[in-house]
Amino acid sequence: VPLSRTVRCTCISISNQPVNPRSLEKLEIIPASQFCPRVEIIATMKKKGEKRCLNPESKAIKNLLKAVSKERSKRSP
C-alpha cells in the first residue's frame, strides 16, 4: 500500500456517486482520529475488489449507510 508516516488521511478524492448495496463487499467507516481529523468511508466493491472513498456528507451516501445498517439489523438476531 502506498503509505508513509506522513500520509494522514486515506482518501485523495471522495465520490458522491450512489453505490448499489448489492454490489458492496464491505463498507468501512473510519472515525476521525489524531491522524485524520475527518470521518472516512471506504466501500469495497465485489467487482475486482475495487475500493472507493465515499463522501460522508452526500445524501446518496447517507442513504447507503442507512440501507446497510437496516440490512445488518435484519440479519442480526
Epitope: 500500500v1 502506498p2 486515506t10 482518501c11 478524492s13 471522495i14 456517486q17 475527518r38
Partner: antibody, heavy 124, light 109 residues
Framework: QMQLVESGGGVVQPGRSLRLSCTAS????????MHWVRQAPGKGLEWVAV????????FYVDSVKGRFTISRDNSKNTLYLEMNSLRAEDTAIYYC?????????????????WGQGTTVTVSS | EIVLTQSPGTLSLSPGERATLSCRAS???????LAWYQQKPGQAPRLLIY???SRATGIPDRFSGSGSGTDFTLTISRLEPEDFAVYYC??????????FGPGTKVDIL
C-alpha cells in the same frame, strides 16, 4: 463538461518565481485530489505534486521539494503551484490534472481530467 | 523508488494491426496502482486504463490492459488512425509519488 484551465505561465529568469493557477468547472472541485504534471520540450511526462481534496496532504517529486508549493482554494475552484528559485530544468508545459472520483491510498483511479497546459520557460 | 521501463520505444504498425505495449516495473506493483495514458502531439494526456485492466469512461473496447507484479501490457486490438500516439504507463507508489514510464510511440508504418 468537466474542464481545467491553466494560466500563469511565461518566460522567467533563473532564480525568480512564478505562480500557476488552474481553474476547474463542470465538477465538484472540492471532492477531488489534484495534481501538477509537467513535460519538458520533446520529453515524457513527469509528475510534480499532488494535493488531497481537502488539502490535508501534499506531496512532491524530489526535484522540486522546498522550491514548489501546491495549494488550493475550494471556494474559488482553483488549484495553484507556487514556483520559487526556478531553474532552467523547470522549463516545461505544466498540466493540472484531476484525481479520479473515490481514489485513495488503497485504490488509484488515475488522472481522469487534464487541462491543456501552460508553458513555463526559465531562461536568462 | 520504483522505476518503470516501457518497450519498445517506438512501434511501427499499420491501421488494423494489433499493438502490444509493455511496461515493466523495477519492483512489484499492485495492479490497483497501475494506469495507462495516451498523448497525441500538441494535446494533453488522456486516461485510458486504471487498476491495470479497467477502462476509463468513454474509452473504446479495442483498448485493454493486463498484467500483474512487474509486467503490465496495454493492447490495442485493431489500430484505428486516431490511435497513433505516445502511450505512458504510470504507477502510484510509496511516499506517495506518481511515476510515469518513458513512453512508447506508436507510429504509422
Amino acid at each position: 463538461q468537466m474542464q481545467l484551465v491553466e494560466s500563469g505561465g511565461g518566460v522567467v529568469q533563473p532564480g525568480r518565481s512564478l505562480r500557476l493557477s488552474c481553474t476547474a468547472s463542470g465538477f465538484t472541485f472540492s471532492n477531488n485530489g489534484m495534481h501538477w504534471v509537467r513535460q519538458a520540450p520533446g520529453k515524457g511526462l513527469e509528475w510534480v505534486a499532488v494535493i488531497w481534496f481537502d488539502g490535508m496532504n501534499k506531496f512532491y517529486v524530489d526535484s522540486v521539494k522546498g522550491r514548489f508549493t501546491i495549494s488550493r482554494d475550494n471556494s474559488k475552484n482553483t488549484l495553484y503551484l507556487e514556483m520559487n528559485s526556478l531553474r532552467a530544468e523547470d522549463t516545461a508545459i505544466y498540466y493540472c490534472a484531476r484525481e479520479g472520483d473515490g481514489s485513495g491510498i488503497y485504490y488509484y483511479y488515475g488522472m481522469d481530467v487534464w487541462g491543456q497546459g501552460t508553458t513555463v520557460t526559465v531562461s536568462s | 523508488e520504483i522505476v518503470l521501463t516501457q518497450s519498445p520505444g517506438t512501434l511501427s504498425l499499420s491501421p488494423g494491426e494489433r499493438a502490444t505495449l509493455s511496461c515493466r516495473a523495477s519492483q512489484s506493483v499492485s495492479s490497483s496502482y497501475l494506469a495507462w495514458y495516451q498523448q497525441k502531439p500538441g494535446q494533453a494526456p488522456r486516461l485510458l486504463i486504471y487498476g491495470a485492466s479497467s477502462r476509463a469512461t468513454g474509452i473504446p473496447d479495442r483498448f485493454s490492459g493486463s498484467g500483474s507484479g512487474t509486467d503490465f501490457t496495454l493492447t490495442i486490438s485493431r489500430l484505428e488512425p486516431e490511435d497513433f500516439a505516445v502511450y505512458y504507463c504510470q504507477q502510484y507508489g510509496s511516499s506517495p509519488i506518481f511515476t510515469f514510464g518513458p513512453g512508447t510511440k506508436v507510429d504509422i508504418l
